[in-house]
């Protein structure tokens, strides 16, 4: 199956050229997507190419600039946010990245009614998070770990919390582990639908052990970065949820929301908060042993001025075969009655599907079913539910958007995207306006990405928002590799793989094989998406075959595959990569003396273990920023899949699954180990320990560190990294430079 954009065949083959590494490093063939910034049922904002902020009205067809590029430039703004009453815009500048999602910035408020910046009671700097209320123009922001509220942009602020302290107490923003492994956001505060209440989380990191690493910078002495970071089994943050009435916040003060008794009895996490109405809120909690989740619906009691979370409104989700949920526990999408909701969780056959919960989870009505998985609920209106799944044609690596009519009985299902641009588009996401009056579809491939606007009632395409014409033209004279997505059936396990083949691929010839692996729990590498990246170059120019394989532990193919790795990370993921390689060799076009494997992060862990498997399959391999022992990684992530590193739990497998334990087995492979010294996520410690074990075992290996670089190895390091890895692979495969 060739999953590539069709183009007119050029008879003059010599005008076609292969991809170069420079193309990749320069981002020559990057694509654009168009996500409307919806501000009503029929209006959206978009930042034009020349940086004007333009308001589009779909129904009138009119558009006008609400904020000029001149105003944006006057404060060097890189982002903006319109207040819901459309009177003010915040402009964001001085962006300074912290962790994966978090950053600080300077904010200016621009008054659209008089065309001036708001003077007096300006916002402090730098701010950690800022957002408008959902109605009007109240502002909530976090500064120095404390939350502040402004009734109007020009008003003085009201300080809601006072105990915020760097690396100790976090109000309204997550600490490191909650940001990375639980919330996946830079914020931990949530406005109620009409802005009456503001809910926020307080994270107490006082007792968490600190990871410290050197940041070399340019000074005479390096500085030390300290992050409260709970590794597996360590003390975790203590979380509390508060809600404050924003009309008169000085009166009652923040009210703590009670934790369900069955959760509070031992260590626990808060996992998400969903407002239902202004006076009803839904909180999700998770036991530290992450197989029990509780969804708690709480109501505001006006007479008591308190939040009441009755036991009758607690819904328990438990997994007996693995952990609760997929990567995260899913969040509920409430229906119009403000008490029943739709939620994705495993059905009795072990596939994640949409369920409708009216009273108890036990009485849940299953909305979707089949040997495929529902992946995301986008929107529930009074008569429709929009969701994505990988049902169509039984390809787990696809995403199509479906509509279920919930207003009629029996509910009818329609695939909105399956036949729109079938060859070009098999992997979609969507963005809906208020009441799903309109929506944008963003197609990521396998062909060149395209974004389109649709009528929410008829699903009719209204217009193309972005079709990447320039990219299409630029690719016309490029010899792109061929891609195929197929499956292997091995011992009752289905292994889906993507193979990237050189442009002039000939099955009768032998090619070097590079396995690219991630393999982390609930991940998916084999997806029908467009990409022109490093491995595209390796196939196009260097004539390598590249394969990606989704083995046990990966997502969207049912719980049997997903939970197979529960409590034994580092075993089946590696086995399945090896099994796939053996199958690829059997196909006859792989040079079995030239097989390599590489991966980053979890993929670096898997590639290291595969190289040290003792199979003799791999000639060489690369691990970028690998985990080397699960005792070194974050508690929230690690314990979800591995339990605790204690004698009475799973310490034995923690010890058995380290890369260091296999140091001897690296003797017969060429190993390139790479890590950034300022990696806040997978600490440099991981690679330092691998290197130490290899030295102690007197095993030769290659290594590269990137000073002051984090887990992403960005900027100039990226160029150096890919150039270095290219040289390493070409040398391994005896390819001339």
């Amino acid at each position: 199956i060739v999953l590539r954009p069709s183009r007119v065949h050029n008879s003059e083959e010599n005008t076609m050229r292969a991809l170069t590494l420079k193309d990749i490093l320069n981002g020559t063939f990057s694509y654009k997507t168009f996500f409307p910034n919806w501000i009503s049922g029929q209006e959206y904002l978009h930042q034009s190419a020349d940086n004007n902020i333009v308001l589009y009205n779909i129904e009138t067809g009119q558009s006008y600039t609400i904020l000029s590029n001149r105003t944006m430039k006057s404060v060097n703004a890189s982002n903006y946010g319109l207040s819901p009453d459309r009177q003010f815009v915040y402009l964001e500048s001085d962006y300074s990245k912290l962790w994966r999602y978090s950053y600080t910035a300077t904010y200016y408020i621009y008054d659209l009614s008089n065309g001036e910046f708001v003077r007096g009671n300006e916002l402090p700097r730098p701010i950690q998070y800022l957002c408008w209320s959902p109605v009007g123009s109240k502002l909530a922001y976090v500064y120095q770990n404390n939350i502040y509220l402004k009734q109007r942009p020009g008003d003085p602020p009201f300080q809601i919390t006072f105990n915020g302290r760097e690396n100790k107490i976090f109000n309204g923003i997550p600490d490191w582990v909650y940001e990375e492994e639980m919330l996946a956001t830079k914020y931990a505060l949530w406005w109620s639908p009409n802005g009456k209440f503001l809910a926020y989380a307080e994270f107490n990191d006082t007792d968490i052990p600190v990871i410290a690493y050197s940041y070399y910078g340019d000074e005479q002495y390096p500085r030390t970065i300290n992050i409260p970071y709970p590794k597996a089994g360590a003390k975790n943050p203590v979380v509390r949820i508060f809600i404050i009435d924003t009309t008169y916040p000085a009166y009652v003060g923040p009210q703590e929301v009670p934790v369900p008794a069955m959760i509070a009895s031992s260590d626990y996490y808060f996992s998400w908060l969903t407002w239902v109405t202004d006076e009803r809120v839904c909180l999700q909690w998770l036991k530290r042993v992450q197989n029990v989740s509780v969804l708690s619906i709480c109501d505001f009691r006006e007479d008591w001025q308190t939040w009441d979370c009755p036991k009758t409104q607690e819904h328990i989700e438990e997994s007996r075969t693995g952990w609760a949920g997929g990567f995260f526990v899913s969040t509920p999408v409430f229906s119009y009655d403000a008490i029943s909701y739709y939620k994705i969780f495993s059905d009795k056959d072990g596939y994640k599907h949409i369920h409708y919960i009216k009273d108890t989870v036990e009485n849940a009505i299953q909305i979707t079913s089949g040997k495929w998985e529902a992946i995301n609920i986008f929107r529930v209106t009074q008569d429709s539910l929009f969701y994505s799944s990988n049902e169509f044609e039984e390809y787990p690596g696809r995403r199509n958007i479906y509509r279920i009519s919930i207003g009629s009985y029996p509910p009818s299902k329609k695939c909105v995207t399956c036949h729109l641009r079938k060859e070009r588009c098999q992997y979609y996401t969507a963005s809906f306006s208020d009441y799903a009056k309109y929506y944008a579809l963003v197609c990521y491939g396998p062909g060149i990405p395209i974004s389109t606007l649709h009528d929410g009632r008829t699903d009719q395409e209204i217009k193309i928002l972005e079709e990447n014409k320039e990219l299409e033209n630029a690719l016309k004279n490029i010899q792109l590799p061929k891609e195929e997505i197929k499956k292997l059936e091995v011992d009752e396990i289905t292994l889906w793989y993507k193979m990237i083949l050189p442009p002039q691929f000939d099955r009768s010839k032998k090619y070097p094989l590079l396995i690219q692996v991630y393999g982390g729990p609930c991940s998916q590498s084999v997806r029908s998406v467009f990409a022109v990246n490093w491995i595209s170059y390796l196939a196009s120019k260097e004539g390598m075959v590249i394969a990606l394989v989704d083995g046990r532990g990966t997502a969207f193919q049912g719980d049997k595959l997903l939970y197979a790795v529960y409590r034994k990370l580092g075993v089946y993921e590696v086995e399945d990569q090896i099994t796939a390689v053996r199958k690829f060799i059997e196909m006859g076009f792989i040079d079995e003396k030239r097989i390599a494997i590489w991966g980053w992060s979890y993929g670096g862990y898997v590639s290291s273990l595969a190289l040290a498997s003792g199979t003799g399959l791999f000639k060489c391999g690369i691990a970028v920023a690998p985990v080397s022992s699960w005792e070194y990684y974050a508690s929230v992530y690690t314990e979800r899949f591995m339990g605790l590193p204690t004698k009475d739990d799973n310490l034995e497998h923690y010890k058995n699954s380290t890369v260091m334990a296999r140091a001897e087995y690296f003797r017969n492979v060429d190993y390139l180990l790479i890590h950034g010294t300022a990696d806040d996520n997978v600490h440099f410690q991981n690679s330092a320990q691998i290197a130490k074990a290899l030295v102690n075992a007197q095993v030769d290996f290659q290594a590269m560190w990137y000073s002051d670089q984090n887990h992403g190895l960005s900027g100039l390091s990226t160029n150096h990294l890919y150039t270095h890895m290219t040289h390493f692979l070409k040398q391994c495969f005896s390819l001339s430079d």
Epitope: G120, N121, K150, Q151, R152, D155, P156, F158, Q159, F162, N163, R240, F242, T247, Y248, P249, A250, Y251, V252, G253, P254, Q255, E256, R301, D303, W304, Q305, T306
Partner: antibody, heavy 116, light 108 residues
Framework: EVQLLESGGGLVQPGGSLRLSCAAS????????MSWVRQAPGKGLEWVSA???????YYADSVKGRFTISRDNSKNTLYLQMNSLRAQDTAVYYC??????????WGQGTLVTVSS | EIVLTQSPGTLSLSPGERATLSCRAS???????LAWYQQKPGQAPRLLII???TRATGIPDRFSGSGSGTDFTLTISRLEPEDFAVYYC?????????FGQGTKVEIK
């Protein structure tokens, strides 16, 4: 009907201690922030301290380190432990319902006299 | 801390007359955090106005509040005999919350 009843006031020497209590009824005490406000003889009102429903405490600079506010939600009672008392702490002490403002219910007050 | 200055210190008026009490803040106060109280001799204060202009529960409509920023006003449209007392403005914008020194409304 909401009622706040202070007790524990009296005459104390400078440097001495007193513990004021405020018994609350007629509302869900455990859900509300509560404050102590004082009024020196013939003078205006001065906020002293507050405590959230969840127990976080706030103090005026003039009493910080000497006074401790606390609550026992099971007994519906608010306390103010006053140590190292000074002459300028002489006042009628009111317990009030609220955190930093909108004090909608007040007790009748208890007089604290600090004198040698 | 925010200093609230009330004026006049004393207001001598007759029943039935209109009383206008002023409260000036040393720095800007958002309307949501400005309250007014009434206190009679030997009694605890009583909440009159919240959010600068909203009457508290059970407060007669002859009491009204207005203002924003640094200048706030309490108006009693027609003084009743029971209205003669000391009136305090109070801000809850910042810690510590502070009260004005009070305006005494006395019978002329």
């Amino acid at each position: 009907e909401v009622q706040l009843l202070e007790s524990g006031g009296g005459l104390v020497q400078p440097g001495g201690s007193l513990r004021l209590s405020c018994a609350a009824s007629g509302f869900t005490f455990s859900s509300h922030a509560m404050s102590w406000v004082r009024q020196a003889p013939g003078k205006g009102l001065e906020w002293v301290s507050a405590i959230w429903a969840s127990g976080e405490q706030y103090y005026a600079d003039s009493v910080k380190g000497r006074f401790t506010i606390s609550r026992d939600n099971s007994k519906n009672t608010l306390y103010l432990q006053m140590n190292s008392l000074r002459a300028q702490d002489t006042a009628v002490y009111y317990c009030a319902k609220g955190w930093l403002g909108n004090f909608d219910y007040w007790g009748q007050g208890t007089l604290v006299t600090v004198s040698s | 801390e925010i200093v609230l200055t009330q004026s006049p210190g004393t207001l001598s008026l007759s029943p039935g007359e209109r009383a206008t009490l002023s409260c000036r803040a040393s720095q800007s106060v958002s309307r949501s955090y400005l309250a007014w109280y009434q206190q009679k001799p030997g009694q605890a204060p009583r909440l009159l106005i919240i959010g600068a202009s909203t009457r508290a529960t059970g407060i007669p409509d002859r009491f009204s509040g207005s203002g924003s920023g640094t200048d706030f006003t309490l108006t009693i449209s027609r003084l009743e005999p029971e209205d003669f007392a000391v009136y305090y403005c109070q801000q809850g914008q910042v810690i510590p919350p502070t009260f004005g020194q009070g305006t005494k409304v006395e019978i002329k």
